[in-house]
Interface confidence: medium
């Protein structure tokens, strides 16, 4: 492992979708790629009038978007779909939105999965 | 070097069967999902199928659905497309490709392609 | 099953000229967007991944942007290897779907 750099070899795996496109529903996927690209794990969500709503979580492919994050952060303002990664083994088990434009102390918390989704 | 090559393309009447293969190589094969796109001349591409890394699940365009199976051998390091009541609208260059992890986020690597030409 | 829609579907340019595709998906697919190339009679090729990666090997005048629905594939310097179809793709769910392409021609 290169220093400083933590390894993501395996993510948290989720699909809502799990039906339609022929997958597990929730399990632990292990993340291959080529030796020298680096892997991340990734969460994204929905967030129906309160109602945290997680479309899918797994590896990620290199991206230089997620490099050095050992958290899963959202920093966009207030998108459809929320979409946050990072780096090291089921980094992805929380996932959190602290939008970039706010200037006070975020209100958001970190999102926790709960069952029966994610045991 | 990752390689992916199609073979098993041909000409075939309306209502036949054709079967593909793609042997793969340079890459752990069964580490992989794998996915079928296809080309009608002069056309765009169109997403025909998919499987996981262990045959386990499979997925299929509306458009095949019921005619096509995909399928794979990871000891022979192959993927296989059955098609069968072929109809003209099928004829295409048909590729096979790599999804680039377990859920297809890209396809990462791609065969020549092999023409199939449903004629009668 | 979510439209994929390419515009312009052709375009002229010279070499050195800076290049934009657009790719609106018909709803939002998050970063699960996908840039190929293809020339005349050859397999299409990964440019992009994610948006904005770029594949293994491919030069840093192709750049991707966007996120949500609206996505943009800029090549800062048109090379005269460059004249090919270009194609956008989701992978946000099945079934994966392209857009109708982009063929960029020699003016």
């Known amino acids: 492992a290169i220093l400083g750099r933590s390894e993501t070899q395996e993510c948290l795996f989720f699909n809502a979708n799990w039906e339609k496109d022929r997958t597990n529903q929730t399990g632990v996927e292990p993340c291959y790629g080529d030796k020298d690209k680096r892997r991340h794990c990734f969460a994204t969500w929905k967030n129906i009038s309160g109602s945290i709503e997680i479309v899918k979580q797994g590896c990620w492919l290199d991206d230089i978007n997620c490099y050095d994050r050992t958290d899963c952060v959202e920093k966009k303002d207030s998108p459809e779909v929320y979409f946050c990664c990072c780096e090291g083994n089921m980094c992805n088990e929380k996932f959190s939105y602290f939008p970039e434009m706010e200037v006070t102390q975020p209100t958001s918390n970190p999102v926790t999965p709960k069952p029966p989704y994610y045991n | 070097e990752v390689q992916l090559l199609e073979s098993g393309g041909g000409l075939v009447q309306p209502g036949g069967s054709l079967r593909l293969s793609c042997a793969a190589s340079?890459?752990?094969?069964?580490?992989?999902?794998m996915n079928w796109v296809r080309q009608a001349p002069g056309k765009g591409l169109e997403w025909v199928s998919n499987?996981?890394?262990?045959?386990?699940?499979?997925g299929y365009a509306d458009s095949v659905k019921g005619r096509f199976t995909i399928s794979r051998d990871n000891s022979k390091n192959t993927l296989y497309l059955q098609m069968n009541s072929l109809r003209a609208e099928d004829t295409a260059v048909y590729y096979c490709?790599?999804?680039?992890?377990?859920?297809?986020?890209?396809?990462?690597?791609w065969g020549q392609g092999t023409l199939v030409t449903v004629s009668s | 099953d979510i439209q994929m829609t390419q515009s312009p579907s052709s375009l002229s340019a010279s070499v050195g000229d800076r290049v934009t595709i657009t790719c609106r998906a018909s709803?939002?697919?998050?970063?699960?967007l996908n840039w190929y190339q293809q020339k005349p009679g050859k397999a299409p090729k990964l440019l992009i991944y994610?948006?904005?990666s770029l594949a293994s090997g491919v030069p840093s005048r192709f750049s991707g942007s966007g996120s949500g629905t609206d996505f943009t594939l800029t090549i800062s310097s048109l090379q005269p290897e460059d004249f090919a179809t270009y194609y956008c793709?989701?992978?946000?769910?099945?079934?994966?779907?392209f857009g109708g392409g982009t063929k960029v021609e020699i003016k």
């Open positions: 490709a790599r999804g680039a992890n377990w859920h297809d986020t890209a396809l990462d690597y």
């Open positions: 340079g890459f752990t094969f069964d580490s992989y999902s």
């Open positions: 499987i996981n890394y262990n045959g386990g699940y499979t």
């Open positions: 709803q939002s697919i998050s970063r699960y």
């Open positions: 994610a948006v904005t």
């Open positions: 793709q989701q992978s946000y769910e099945s079934p994966l779907t």
